[in-house]
């Protein structure tokens, strides 16, 4: 019995109703390995999911997220709502990043601006909700003899942007 079933290829199952012959997987099911006694149910890409790859008798369907959502988890097991840049998703929906933080993507959380002074540098471009600060040369590098066409913005920590 074991040997008979091991001969059943992917896309079939070993059917005990028929003296262990290999039967094709029923509609909407698949077996990706040989010797299976029951085929697995195809994943359905419904609701916020859309089909990226159709199910076949030997491989499962693959899902993506519809517009306005992005995949989370292994094999896109969940779809999470997109937010705008400068926002993060909370239990109450998309919220603007707090002052001193930014998010340059449609997903993920707001992160603190870089603290330029920790690297001994100054703020070259102020941070916003959507963008991190840009750190410039350290104040010591900004001697009168230094070749700089335009003076940098005054150093403000952690970087100021009117919001």
């Amino acid at each position: 019995l074991q040997d008979l079933c091991s001969n059943c290829p992917a896309g079939t199952f070993c059917d005990n109703n028929r003296s262990q012959i290999c039967s094709p997987c029923p509609p909407n099911s698949f077996s990706s390995a040989g010797g299976q006694r029951t085929c697995d149910i195809c994943r359905q890409c419904k609701g916020v999911f859309k089909t990226r790859k159709e199910c076949s008798s030997t491989s499962n369907a693959e899902c993506d997220c519809i517009s306005g959502y992005h995949c989370l988890g292994a094999e896109c097991s969940m779809c999470e709502q997109d937010c705008k840049q400068g926002q993060e998703l909370t239990k109450k929906g998309c919220k603007d990043c707090c002052f001193g933080t930014f998010n340059d993507q449609k997903r993920g959380i707001c992160r603190p601006w870089t603290n330029c002074s920790l690297d001994g540098k100054s703020v070259l471009v102020n941070g916003t909700k959507e963008r991190d600060v840009v750190c410039g040369p350290s104040p010591a590098d900004l001697s009168p003899g230094a070749s700089s066409a335009t003076p940098p913005a005054p150093a403000r920590e952690p970087g100021h942007s009117p919001q």
Epitope: N17, A33, G35, T38
Partner: antibody, heavy 118, light 108 residues
Framework: QVQLQQSEAELVRPGASVKISCKAF????????INWVKQRPGQGLDWIGY????????TFNRKFKDKATLTVHKSSSTAYMELSGLTSDDSAVYYC???????????WGRGTVVTVSS | EIVMTQSPATLSVSPGERATLSCRAS??????LAWYQQKPGQAPRLLIY???TRATGIPARFSGSGSGTDFTLTISSLQSEDFAVYYC??????????FGQGTKVEIK
């Protein structure tokens, strides 16, 4: 002897979780899906979902997707179902059952009684 | 999801008589239907699968028929051990696999 042996009855508090087990004897564990079925006292049968021990693939009844987590431990031929956020509605007998061929259940465990009470 | 409706809810039959149980699906399930027997305090037991095939060890007095939406389980001559609750279950196409609410066969 081919059988599915389930864990003993559980009495749990509302809001808690419980993990019940189903150990397979007499057949190759990875060859057959393990399904879980709920039966409330004096009521009918409700299919929760299955796990394929060969590849850990799971399929759920949508209404149990956030309630039940299905896992297997291949080396001990044991399937587990964890139920979380328990309420009185989760008080029931839970059966594990095997499939072979199409998705009918040819072998059943004796059931685990879960009682949710404060 | 496919809804399975069994009738009657209770069937009173004398030992030795014939019992006919009905199961109707809300949409076609082809021949993908099983019947189970459950006695008090016990797990269900598979009787019939694929609408009409008897499971291993099931006596010949149990027979199943039907396809599409209408199915019948017949017990040709009821024995004392046959008094129980009987459930139908569809396993067609997509899950969830669904059961009927059961028919209780009791002694008349």
């Amino acid at each position: 002897q081919v059988q599915l042996q389930q864990s003993e009855a559980e009495l749990v508090r509302p809001g808690a979780s419980v993990k019940i087990s189903c150990k397979a004897f007499g057949y190759t564990f990875t060859n057959h899906h393990i399904n879980w079925v709920k039966q409330r006292p004096g009521q009918g049968l409700d299919w929760i979902g299955y796990i394929n021990p060969y590849n850990d693939y799971t399929t759920f009844n949508r209404k149990f997707k956030d309630k039940a987590t299905l896992t297997v431990h291949k080396s001990s031929s044991t399937a587990y179902m964890e139920l979380s956020g328990l309420t009185s509605d989760d008080s029931a007998v839970y059966y594990c059952a095997r499939t072979w061929g199409h998705w009918y259940f040819d072998l059943w465990g004796r059931g685990t009684v879960v009682t949710v009470s404060s | 999801e496919i809804v399975m409706t069994q009738s009657p809810a209770t069937l009173s039959v004398s030992p030795g008589e014939r019992a006919t149980l009905s199961c109707r699906a809300s949409q076609s399930v082809s021949s993908n239907l099983a019947w189970y027997q459950q006695k008090p305090g016990q797990a269900p037991r598979l009787l019939i699968y694929d609408s009409s095939t008897r499971a291993t060890g099931i006596p010949a007095r149990f027979s199943g028929s039907g396809s599409g939406t209408d199915f019948t389980l017949t017990i040709s001559s009821l024995q004392s051990e046959d008094f129980a609750v009987y459930y139908c279950q569809q396993y067609n196409n997509w899950p969830p696999w669904t059961f009927g609410q059961g028919t209780k066969v009791e002694i008349k």
